[in-house]
């Protein structure tokens, strides 16, 4: 058997670090057998069999000119093997970050903090950490580790499925190359890394007969679980075209009626989502949707109650506003205490 331990990486390649002493090992001989060393394609003897170093070649303070293929020969001139030297650096701890778009799964991505110049792979795993007792800061022995399955095709990402919202996890990403391994440990809780995807299907419609109104509606992001235990709350921003500043409101559901739009001007609207108990952070903004308030007047006939687009208003009771209702279902919110000024203007 070969006296040379096979480092992780392609066969026949041995590794060293620039500026350090490097030992090359002749693979096809018995340990300690004296050999001669040559550079491939060069007749000059690098190290003879009388060096006292047996089957090894020592290169002091290796640099890039030492990279390449070496040949070792036994005393009788037989080929002991060929070795390719590649120089690089041991792994440095990778940089790791984790994010969650819902409360059941999270993903972690990593980048090398320093390029080693050598073949590199990553080992990814996680443990669940649990607290002992409600008022205790001590942690029980963690459970796991379990592998964090990596994306195919070499994307630097792994995903933990079926995570528990209230648990803490310790992520282990280890960078491995032929010169060693280096580990980054990252403690994450789903609550702190939760950032929903932006709401989808944003639509902005005029409200016929109301020249200062726009109705915006949207849906939950597709990535949010279909039957959620946790709801989302929303933040909506709108502004007239060419106006630099956004106005912000926090709707109670999946719809909002804007009552102070500028008549005749198109308005940009966008919406963002967050866990309704304020875990994590707000999503990025949805793509903007545009709408222009109606230019018409109130129709003479009062339509059926269900036809919300043209429903005229009744003076709302300002002293008893509806409680906020996080809801999966869109619910009409035409009436609002902010409406009274416009109502006077329209109905006068």
């Amino acid at each position: 058997s070969s006296p040379c331990p096979q480092a992780w990486g392609p066969p026949g390649v041995q590794y060293g670090q620039p500026g350090r002493s490097v030992k090359l090992c002749c693979p096809g001989v018995t340990a300690g057998d004296p050999v001669s060393w040559f550079r491939d394609g060069e007749p000059k003897l690098l190290q003879g069999p009388d060096s006292g170093l047996g089957h090894e070649l020592v290169l002091a303070q290796a640099d890039s000119t030492d990279e390449g293929t070496y040949i070792c020969q036994t005393l009788d001139g037989a080929l002991g093997g060929t070795v390719t030297l590649q120089l690089g650096y041991p792994p440095a701890r990778p940089v790791v970050s984790c994010q969650a778009a819902d409360y059941e799964n999270f993903s972690c991505t990593w980048s090398p903090s320093q390029i080693s110049g050598l073949p590199t792979r990553y080992l990814t795993s996680y443990r669940k950490k649990t607290v002992l007792g409600a008022d205790s800061q001590r942690r029980s022995p963690s459970t796991g580790p379990w592998p964090c399955p990596q994306d195919p095709l070499g994307a630097a990402r792994c995903v933990v499925h079926g995570a528990e919202f209230w648990s803490q996890y310790r992520i282990n990403v280890t960078e491995v190359n032929p010169l060693g391994a280096s580990t980054r440990l990252l403690d994450v809780s789903l609550q702190s890394i939760l950032r929903p995807d932006p709401p989808q299907g944003l639509r902005v419609e005029s409200v016929p007969g109301y020249p200062r109104r726009l109705r915006a509606s949207w849906t939950y992001p597709a990535s949010w679980p279909c039957q959620p235990h946790f709801l989302l709350k929303f933040r909506l921003q709108y502004r007239p075209a060419q106006h630099p500043a956004w106005s912000t409101v926090e709707p109670a559901g999946l719809e909002e009626v804007i009552t102070d739009a500028v008549a005749g001007l198109p308005h940009a609207v966008r919406v963002s989502a967050r866990d309704f108990l304020d875990a994590g952070t707000w999503s990025t903004w949805s793509p903007e949707a545009w709408g222009t308030p109606s230019t018409g007047t109130i129709p003479k006939e009062i339509p059926a109650w269900g036809q919300l687009h043209t429903q005229p208003e009744v003076e709302p009771q300002v002293d008893s506003p509806a409680p906020p209702r996080p809801s999966l279902q869109p619910h009409p919110r035409l009436l609002d205490h902010r409406d009274s000024v416009e109502q006077v203007a329209v109905l006068a």
């Epitope: 440095a92 940089v95 790791v96 980048s111 090398p112 903090s113």
Partner: antibody, heavy 118, light 107 residues
Framework: EVQLLESGGGLVQPGGSLRLSCAAS????????MTWVRQAPGKGLEWVSS????????QYADSVKGRFTISRDNSKNTLYLQMNSLRAEDTAVYYC???????????WGRGTLVTVSS | DIQMTQSPSSLSASVGDRVTITCQAS??????LNWYQQKPGKAPKLLIY???NLQTGVPSRFSGSGSGTDFTFTISSLQPEDIATYYC?????????FGPGTKVDIK
């Protein structure tokens, strides 16, 4: 020999913007994480921001998050710090520093002075 | 963020004296600690990395020790050129932090 040369500092009014550059030479720039560290007059050192070799991960001190952006151009061996909404407390000498790895600063530039004042 | 404290904040010693500075982290940082020297008007210079390793070219009178939360930096025999401010710095997590510094001068 590793060399890091910062530029782009100067006097700017509160609320203004500035872009710092760090020209690197003497090493394979695209292999290393890079960092900005600052030092207010008469004060200690404060880490500002770091970026991995690929640019794919960045990190910021809370004091500059949302206002400063770190970036790099590996083809030009240059590190950048875009500073917006500047405040008086951002007045400092800004140093560019390199790894190895993340958060360990083995080589430093000479620094460039940023003064935020009206 | 991990907080770093250093003591003393300043000290005066005679040439040839042994000088010791301590650094404490608010949580375990393993051995992910560096020590830097900064002279007035100059950039910082790395002296010690990974808590106890002497950077190439740094005189052997400088040394470091410790692990976890408590670390020590020592100048075995203070020289006039050692007048400077010394900083510890952790890099255990992704947001590195520096200690407030210790100013060293000659009596």
């Amino acid at each position: 020999e590793v060399q890091l040369l910062e530029s782009g500092g100067g006097l700017v009014q509160p609320g203004g913007s500035l872009r710092l550059s760090c020209a690197a030479s003497g090493f394979t720039f695209s292999w290393y994480s890079m960092t900005w560290v600052r030092q207010a007059p008469g004060k200690g050192l404060e880490w500002v921001s770091s970026i991995v070799p690929s640019g794919g991960h960045t990190q910021y001190a809370d004091s500059v998050k949302g206002r400063f952006t770190i970036s790099r151009d590996n083809s030009k061996n240059t590190l950048y710090l875009q500073m917006n909404s500047l405040r008086a407390e951002d007045t400092a000498v800004y140093y560019c520093a390199k790894g190895p790895g993340w958060g360990s600063f083995w080589q430093w530039g000479r620094g460039t002075l940023v003064t935020v004042s009206s | 963020d991990i907080q770093m404290t250093q003591s003393p904040s300043s000290l005066s010693a005679s040439v040839g004296d042994r000088v010791t500075i301590t650094c404490q982290a608010s949580q375990d940082i393993n051995n992910y600690l560096n020590w830097y020297q900064q002279k007035p008007g100059k950039a910082p210079k790395l002296l010690i990395y990974d808590a106890s390793n002497l950077q190439t070219g740094v005189p052997s009178r400088f040394s470091g020790s410790g692990s976890g939360t408590d670390f020590t930096f020592t100048i075995s025999s203070l020289q006039p050129e050692d007048i400077a401010t010394y900083y510890c710095q952790q890099y255990d997590n992704l947001s590195p932090t520096f200690g407030p510094g210790t100013k060293v001068d000659i009596k």
